[in-house]
Amino acid sequence: MVPEEEPQDREKGLWWFQLKVWSMAVVSILLLSVCFTVSSVVPHNFMYSKTVKRLSKLREYQQYHPSLTCVMEGKDIEDWSCCPTPWTSFQSSCYFISTGMQSWTKSQKNCSVMGADLVVINTREEQDFIIQNLKRNSSYFLGLSDPGGRRHWQWVDQTPYNENVTFWHSGEPNNLDERCAIINFRSSEEWGWNDIHCHVPQKSICKMKKIYI
Amino acid sequence: LGEPQLCYILDAILFLYGIVLTLLYCRLKIQVRKAAITSYEKSDGVYTGLSTRNQETYETLKHEKPPQ
Amino acid sequence: LGEPQLCYILDAILFLYGIVLTLLYCRLKIQVRKAAITSYEKSDGVYTGLSTRNQETYETLKHEKPPQ
């Protein structure tokens, strides 16, 4: 036999059940909302912090590079690769032809002041790109030297010197006292490398990694 | 975590939530459909009281487990 | 559209889907519970056939609308 208060109990039970179910619905929706808010707000904050980071990164360079020329890398608007405005870009590097004439040490110092090094040439394609911007009647220091005068050539960025990827003029290097390398034009062989005395002022080529912001 | 990674993680969470809830919803629908058929056979048309006009106020059968 | 934008659009769709399905699920739960009580009162215990052992196989009552 069912007790008399059973309908009220049932109603009360139903009410509690509804309360539980809707509470769970509210909790679920709240959790979903939190997720969605996180996915909307965090990226916004992330973008903001990324922008702040970018600005501080730009400020680092601003002392020597008041303006940058940037291009979008790929499809993602997040990734920009930049070179200082008068510099030219090739692959992942930026290049600057310094027309001021300085000794090799000063040329390297001048590049380092701009956050770069004297150019390290790794491929024929790179050299072919660089020479497009050079004047035939000038010589330009490379980031290649033989400090000990023992024909142990070394690049300024510690890239291993690979005899197979060198572009010396024929007969060069030819003097143990000439411990720095230049790139120059010879009518017979076009552009190639030559060893010279480091203290004689020359123009130079600086190279730096692209700035990614 | 980077911005895109975070978005993908949240996508995954929402996606899993959607799948689980879809499965639960479908399971509940099927259970109720079966229950209706069973009870109809047993009570010889007890459900006449629940006409099509009342379809939209069907409520859940007693179910100990909370929704997942 | 870029990859991140697509991710956010997908987020929004999944979010809305999650909310709609949560509401539908809860509504169905309650509808089924109400239906159970109503039918209990009408048939004086027809539902004894659906004991607690069978709770997990409850099926949907007749419902014209397909699940959304």
């Epitope: 001021g100 004439m101 300085q102 000794s103 040490t105 000063k106 110092k109 001048n110 002041v113 010589s139 006292d177 010279i196 005395h197 480091c198 203290h199 004689v200 002022p201 | - | -």
Partner: antibody, heavy 120, light 107 residues
Framework: DVQLQESGPGLVKPSQSLSLTCSVT?????????WNWIRQFPGNKLECMGY???????YYNPSLKNRISITRDTSKNQFFLSLNSVTTEDTATYFC?????????????WGQGTLVTVSA | DIQMTQSPASLSASVGETVTITCRAS??????LAWYQQKQGKSPQLLVY???TLADGVPSRFSGSGSETQYSLKINSLQPEDFGNYFC?????????FGGGTKLEIK
Amino acid sequence: DVQLQESGPGLVKPSQSLSLTCSVTGYSITSAYYWNWIRQFPGNKLECMGYISYDGSNYYNPSLKNRISITRDTSKNQFFLSLNSVTTEDTATYFCVRGGDYDDGGFAYWGQGTLVTVSA
Amino acid sequence: DIQMTQSPASLSASVGETVTITCRASGNIHNYLAWYQQKQGKSPQLLVYNAKTLADGVPSRFSGSGSETQYSLKINSLQPEDFGNYFCQHFWIIPYTFGGGTKLEIK
């Protein structure tokens, strides 16, 4: 020890060319360094005019435009200055100087200088 | 071109005194600065290179200092042979320009 010695006419007429010779002893001008001409005006102001490098390449101060030429005679271990279209403004003491000492940090070797007056 | 501004243009001092001559560059010359002494009718003699290194045979009463654009030459305990003209010259980038000179006279 390296020694440098300037020589040439002390008087040049306006619009003519000024020609000076620097004779170097104690060091071959083809071995290393770069070989400069520097002048000092009557008010004591000093000016680098240009140089010829050990390998024969040149640099000229842009202020002298196309008037200047620096050449050399390696067999005599001499280098030369030629300045065209002179005016009274070119009156100065002319020094030949070796460059590149102390990793190009200072001019350590100077000739004693020769005074050139430009006057009609 | 980098311009070199030297001061003072002239200076009177007594034997035994300490004097300082300054040189300002129009740009950062990264310590590539030389100082010369020139006596009447003679060629300049290198005293200091790379801003602070004394050239061979230069007495230790001479000292150079400075950085970036500001440099100075200090002569402690002036001797009679120290009187004459002094010049600074930068060696950062061609053309290497000179300061206008400082005439150091006996008081």
